[in-house]
């Protein structure tokens, strides 16, 4: 089990001519928000098929007004990453597909109406617990900019969350056939369910239900010594006639790598190193051909006519890894100082300061409470560079000037109007709703004061019909 | 995603009552605001109850006095008593789900009603 995790940096203008109109206006003032949608392997399905590794919705972004006469700049976003948890193993290639989503907030019946702006696919390879990977997509004339990972939950732990970790018992090393869980040191890898009666002393398994024997022990269960005197061949079935047992066949015996995969025994089991397009614990899991497009970014694929050849991608100027879906990361080298974020734009860095900090690289530390008073018997307090103010009951607002307002939340549904109130709030809803946050409609048929369908439903219809 | 399953629904006669039940799974209910909506042959489908997330409640005037509407979020579901029933009340009587989180209506498949003599 583990959790995918999308970070959206940015959704402006593309480069180049045709720069898109901005999607919200003086009149109808919008935000955005963001659907991510994943698929396991590298099928580029239909976007209505399901997600059968999960789906997200973003919170919405901050309320946008395009300035007349500006050209559209890039777009408040939300807060925060986008979070897919997975229950099952992560399976290393998956699909995606991210939507940009407008909220308007005009005074429309109905309430906000959603639509769709742009929508980016992609497929990719990733191990869990690896570093961010950062992508930039094109929609039409809109660029999004993004980095994702998959991570895993204690106790799961390797590259598709499979092997499980648990704290050591001994303090000093892990038992018998278990090793400790990189890069958690200071525990191991928890043993899987084996064959019923497997010796826990002797005996270990790589799948549920088998039993493999530790060096010096064999049988079923791996509960019989091995003795290695009076017998003949160094590795044979055992003779019952002489009593002689001797090891049984090594974890390479046979070469347990599908696909060309070449084995290597380790002190536990064996390992096995694939040719390029086969993954899998041994190599069983098929390969990938240049007609699968498997080489991103504009990367060139080269050989691989059939499952059997390998192909290369050859990487387009700043990216590389062997599928080209890596960054050339000039980021790793943190640029940014203070928590700032670093983004990389192809042609320059650029930093993203957090809130107290400025210049270039943020190296500038802004006095924060210095000349700011707090509103209303409030109090200033100084964080991590970041002003703030602790307000005093009843206010609000980054200087206690406002009073607190129960109506921030946009807690009426459909376009009801809220009002603070001395008990709370009222919602005075639009025509056609009821309930204390009209949240109800009256006619749920009468679809023209309705909003617009938002994701996960089907296009013009208002509502889901299970 | 919000599966809602109704059930209770049948034939009754005038003046007598019956109670509809209504299973939500896939969130729980105490984020949710719930409503019962009836759709008689040959006319729209219409709001008989609801009852918000934080327990307010809400009737068209035909069936006030006559229905209440509860929800156990304990058990995950929302009912309608329907005591005084009349012929007009016949209809497939369908659950309703709003989501606050996310903003999403959901339906269920809907149960009959029948109150003949």
């Known amino acids: 089990a583990g959790v995918f995790e999308l970070q959206i940096h940015s959704f402006g203008p593309g480069p180049g001519p045709g720069a898109p109109r901005s999607p919200c206006s003086a009149r109808l003032p919008c935000r955005l928000f963001f659907r991510v949608c994943l698929k396991p392997g590298l099928s580029e399905e239909a976007a209505e098929s399901p997600c059968a590794l999960g789906a997200a919705l973003s919170a919405r972004g901050p309320v946008y007004t395009e300035q007349p006469g500006a050209p559209a700049p890039d777009l408040p976003l939300p807060d925060g990453l986008l979070q897919v948890p997975f229950r099952d193993a992560w399976p290393g290639t998956f699909s995606f597909i991210i939507e940009t989503w407008r909220e308007e907030l005009g005074d429309q019946i109905g309430g906000p109406a959603w639509s769709l702006l742009a929508r980016v696919a992609g497929r990719r390879r990733l191990a869990a617990g690896g570093p961010w990977a950062r992508d930039i997509q094109r929609a039409g004339a809109w660029e999004l900019r993004f980095s994702y990972r998959a991570r895993c939950e204690p106790p799961a732990v390797g590259t598709a969350c499979t092997r499980l970790c648990r704290p050591r018992s001994a303090p000093s090393r892990c038992g018998p056939g278990l090793r400790p869980c990189a890069p958690l040191e200071d525990e191991c890898e928890a043993p899987l369910v084996c064959r019923a009666g497997c010796s826990p002393e002797h005996g270990f398994c790589e799948q549920p239900g088998e039993c493999r024997c530790l060096e010096g022990w064999t049988g079923p269960l791996c509960t019989v010594p091995v003795s290695t005197s009076s017998c003949l061949s160094p590795r044979g079935p055992s003779s019952a006639t002489t009593g002689c047992l001797v090891p049984g066949p090594g974890p390479c015996d046979g070469n347990p790598c599908a696909n060309g995969g070449s084995c290597s025994e380790t002190p536990r089991s064996f390992e096995c190193t694939c040719p390029r397009g086969f993954y899998g614990l041994r190599c069983e899991v098929s390969g990938v051909t240049c007609a699968d497009g498997p080489c991103f970014n504009g990367g060139l694929c080269v050989g691989g006519a059939d499952p059997d050849s390998a192909y290369i991608c050859h990487c387009p100027p700043g990216f590389q890894g062997s599928n080209c879906e890596k960054r050339v990361d000039r980021c790793s080298l943190q640029p940014c100082r203070n928590g700032g974020l670093c983004l990389d734009l192809g042609h320059a860095l650029r930093c993203r300061c957090r809130a107290g900090f400025a210049g270039p690289r943020c190296e500038h530390d802004l006095d924060d409470c210095a000349g700011r008073a707090c509103a209303n018997g409030g109090t200033c307090v100084e964080g991590g560079g970041a002003h703030r103010c602790s307000c005093a009951l009843g206010f609000g607002g980054r200087d206690c000037r406002e009073r607190a307002d129960p109506c921030a939340a946009r807690p009426c549904a459909h376009g009801g109007r809220c009002y603070a109130h001395f008990s709370g709030l009222v919602c005075a809803c639009a025509p056609g709703y009821m309930g204390a946050r009209c949240e109800f409609p009256v006619h749920p048929d009468g679809a023209s004061a309705l909003p617009a369908a938002p994701p996960g439903l089907r296009p013009g219809d208002p509502q889901r019909y299970l | 995603e919000v599966q809602l399953v109704e059930s209770g629904g049948g034939l009754v006669q005038p003046g007598g009552s019956l109670t509809l039940s209504c299973a939500a799974s896939?969130?729980?209910?105490?984020?949710?605001?719930l409503a019962w909506y009836r759709q008689a042959p040959g006319k729209k489908r219409e709001l008989v109850a609801g009852?918000?997330?934080?327990?307010?409640?809400v009737y068209i005037d035909s069936v006030k006095g006559r229905f209440t509407i509860s929800r156990d979020n304990a058990k995950n579901s929302v009912y309608l008593q329907m005591n005084s029933l009349r012929a007009e009340d016949t209809a497939v009587y369908y659950c309703?789900?709003?989501?606050?989180?996310?903003?999403?209506?959901?339906w269920g498949q809907g149960t009959l009603v029948t109150v003949s003599s």
């Open positions: 309703y789900a709003y989501r606050w989180e996310d903003a999403l209506t959901y």
């Open positions: 896939g969130s729980a209910v105490s984020m949710l605001s």
């Open positions: 009852i918000s997330d934080d327990g307010s409640q």
